[in-house]
């Protein structure tokens, strides 16, 4: 659900930690429409998701650890 | 301790529909997903779909869409499971069971089921 | 969807056996499986998470490996009390899909 690197909506299935290499941020006041974390996945696939979720907000703390461990 | 019970055996007519409560105790309701897994007579389990406390997210398997309603009470840490639109293939035990982010997204207590039958 | 296919579906086996039931996945999971034990009347348990992690209160007779698509439940020396149906899970992605389950009989 991205549109020149924006994501327009969120996708409405729940990714394992397992599954997903990183994420960035994208702001809805830096020229997209919504917030949204862009997970992206071991397969190279970029998925949008909501940031208000309680899983999404799970993972990106897992993997923030992760960054500040190395 | 941990513990999910869940109403009593329920029969009811093609066309009805069904409403099934899973009460938790013992930990902090809001803080783990609950999820719903049937079996049906004769057939493996399978999972029908998820709802977060914390936040009344709803995840579904895609076959119970429009079938399912999820719903939770959290002033009575109590999660529902509602059925509609009955037919015989509903006839299954359902279960309500906890996911646990921390179990590798397992499902580590489970309540004890209850039957639903739909017979005319 | 990702399919998970477990064989074999029945087992017969004597106390003492070692048994090893087998689960695959239709694409790579990456350790992202859990398995589950059921007897009949009661409702499933949690057995092993994370494809190799043995769940709270599960004795050490049981072990999970495998990694991609393929993945082992292994019981080293079966008891009595072992004799259920045995279920793997997919938890990469939703729907979180489950095999058809391998029953496991006395000989």
């Known amino acids: 659900a991205s549109n020149f690197d924006c994501c327009l909506g969120y996708t409405d299935r729940i990714l394992h930690p397992k599954f997903i290499v990183g994420f960035t941020r994208q702001l809805a006041n830096e020229g997209c429409d919504i917030n949204a974390i862009i997970f992206h996945t071991k397969k190279k696939l970029s998925v949008c998701a909501n940031p208000k979720q309680t899983w999404v907000k799970y993972i990106v703390r897992l993997l923030s650890k992760k960054v500040k461990n190395m | 301790q941990v513990q999910l019970v869940q109403s009593g055996a329920e029969v009811k007519k093609p066309g009805a529909s069904v409403k099934v409560s899973c009460k938790a105790s013992?930990?902090?309701?809001?803080?783990?997903?609950m999820h719903w897994v049937r079996q049906a007579p004769g057939q493996g389990l399978e999972w029908m779909g998820l709802?977060?406390?914390?936040?009344?997210?709803?995840n579904y398997n895609q076959k119970f869409k429009g079938k399912a309603t999820l719903t939770v009470d959290t002033s009575t840490s109590t999660a529902y499971m509602e059925l509609s639109s009955l037919r015989s293939e509903d006839t299954a035990v359902y279960y309500c069971?906890?996911?646990?982010?921390?179990?590798?997204?397992?499902?580590?207590?489970w309540g004890q089921g209850t039957l639903v039958t739909v017979s005319s | 969807d990702i399919q998970m296919t477990q064989s074999p579906s029945s087992l017969s086996a004597s106390v003492g056996d070692r048994v090893t039931i087998t689960c695959g996945a239709s694409?790579?999971?990456?350790?992202?499986l859990n398995w589950y034990q059921r007897k009949p009347g009661k409702a499933p348990k949690l057995l092993i998470y994370?494809?190799?992690n043995l769940a709270d209160g599960v004795p050490s007779r049981f072990s999970g490996s495998g990694s991609g698509r393929d993945y082992t439940l292994t019981i080293s020396s079966l008891q009595p009390e072992d004799f259920a149906t045995y279920y793997c899970?997919?938890?990469?992605?939703?729907?979180?899909?489950f095999g058809q389950g391998t029953k496991l009989e006395i000989k």
């Open positions: 013992g930990y902090t309701f809001t803080s783990y997903w």
């Open positions: 694409e790579n999971i990456y350790g992202a």
């Open positions: 069971t906890r996911g646990n982010y921390g179990v590798d997204y397992g499902m580590d207590y």
């Open positions: 709802i977060d406390p914390s936040d009344k997210y709803t």
């Open positions: 994370g494809a190799t």
């Open positions: 899970q997919n938890v990469l992605i939703t729907p979180y899909t």
